[in-house]
Amino acid sequence: SQVSNLLKQQQTNLTHQKNKLEGQISARQQAEEASQESQNELKEMIETLAWKLNEKSKEQMELHHQNLNLQETLKRVANCSAPCPQDWIWHEENCYLFSTGSFNWEKSQEKCLSLDAKLLKINSTADLDFIQQAISYSSFPFWMGLSRRNPSYPWLWEDGSPLMPHLFRIRGAVSQTYPSGTCAYIQRGAVYAENCILAAFSICQKKANLRAQ
Amino acid sequence: SQVSNLLKQQQTNLTHQKNKLEGQISARQQAEEASQESQNELKEMIETLAWKLNEKSKEQMELHHQNLNLQETLKRVANCSAPCPQDWIWHEENCYLFSTGSFNWEKSQEKCLSLDAKLLKINSTADLDFIQQAISYSSFPFWMGLSRRNPSYPWLWEDGSPLMPHLFRIRGAVSQTYPSGTCAYIQRGAVYAENCILAAFSICQKKANLRAQ
């Protein structure tokens, strides 16, 4: 009976220790889960920061290139004569002429070529902003140097370069095929596709004369 | 004795369980330490990335300022020898700017003044021909620098000189009297009189920089 009591006491102690240990394990388990969660959040934060850093690097690279170009232009621009001929508009590195006659796309192209220029090419959102502003007081369409043979072909500028998809959406007769091809015009700030055979105003463009004399 | 054996057996079981739990706690403790270490590494990584991002932002800001300075310089340098500033049209001895906003006559006049210019003045039929051609693709009205207080007063340009009668006929509200005066606008090649309080586009004009370089 004495032995039995002793054993019972030990047993109670052990049960108490076991319960205590189980409680510790449960607490550690919760802590572990919280730690895992926190770790996942940290990893997510790292991913976000890494992405942001990558984006910043890209932006910086772009700014750096812009900088180099500006420095180059600045070198050229020192001591130069008229950047553009009379009646043309000088903007940034280009000269623009808004035609005063209405012609089909091919004829408009020829008119520009005779002036040592090409039909309008939009390279950036800044170019687009300028043109949209320059034609803001007109409700007429203006041919630009963008065309394609049919809907299965890409939109190409006169120099053969493709249209950057983010620049603008082309509306209108985009799904149409015409014997003379499909050409793009800009009107009230939006770009439309239409039969190249139609007569419209146009915008000629050429490099501004920013060379050192 | 039977009870005693049973208790001993339970005690053995409990001891075994206790040892097992202690082992688990020890393992979890090690895992926790490793997790803590890994978390510290992640935090360190975050700190590094955040620092790098901050540095990149500073560099980018610097590049951006450099860029703005270069653009500013480019505009200044380029304007030195160019007959007209960017976005203006050079024709003969003048520079012309077609406003991109719609304002009343007085506000339009102020806008031109802020650009070191005046509202359009037509001195000759050649000037008129150029302007008519330049706005041929617009159906909107453009204020010019011609106004009069009421029908008993003569039409005067901004510089106080009178309108040459042979240049053009003024149509529209010629016999009307308005508290703000009567102003002239050009639209589709014809000149009209209207209440100066109305909003319209406008044409600014200033002398071209044709000094010997």
Partner: antibody
Framework: QVQLLESGGGLVQPGGSLRLSCAAS????????LHWVRQAPGKGLEWVSV????????YYADSVKGRFTISRDNSKNTLYLQMNSLRAEDTAVYYC????????????WGQGTLVTVSS | DIVLTQPPSVSGAPGQRVTISCSGS????????VSWYQQLPGTAPKLLIH???HRPSGVPDRFSGSKSGTSASLAITGLQAEDEADYYC???????????FGGGTKLTVLG
Amino acid sequence: QVQLLESGGGLVQPGGSLRLSCAASGFTFSDYALHWVRQAPGKGLEWVSVISYQGGFIYYADSVKGRFTISRDNSKNTLYLQMNSLRAEDTAVYYCARSPGLTSYHDSWGQGTLVTVSS
Amino acid sequence: DIVLTQPPSVSGAPGQRVTISCSGSSSNIGSNYVSWYQQLPGTAPKLLIHSNSHRPSGVPDRFSGSKSGTSASLAITGLQAEDEADYYCQSWDYESERVVFGGGTKLTVLG
């Protein structure tokens, strides 16, 4: 589905005016060129006018030039034809039709509205 | 002033093949596409063929279009009673800058 619904027809005296409307639904209105085509009683189809997506290109048949004006309101999805100085020979059923391109085919037509010019 | 020339009428028995011609010039059919429309009595015209030979969905393949030089033609095979209608050709004339229609052809299904 695509729907074009003309209205505004009726009896008018020679020299009078009338304004036709064509309400469109079931498609992106501003992505299509719109035409007016008429048909005199017992006769064939005669094209009247076309207007491009934003009204930049507008063309008329010689028979209506200077008298008729085509317009559109993209915010209201509606095409209009303002007819002035009407003549007996303008008597016809007037259809509005949509085109995916200004010079291309008419893939949808309205049911038509009758204009009668008579004294 | 009809610019595109069509025969005023054509006829054929059920099951037969008929063709409708459309003659133009270099400024319309010669340099642009041709479309064909069917107009059943008392209804609005319906597009049958576009871009010379393309059939919109829902148009039976008994209808076909072709173009050669300054002329175009519409062929209908396996003629059916419900094909009895007026048929019009259409193109764009770039010289006069307008849409041009043919005078229309009345198709009669005999029998």
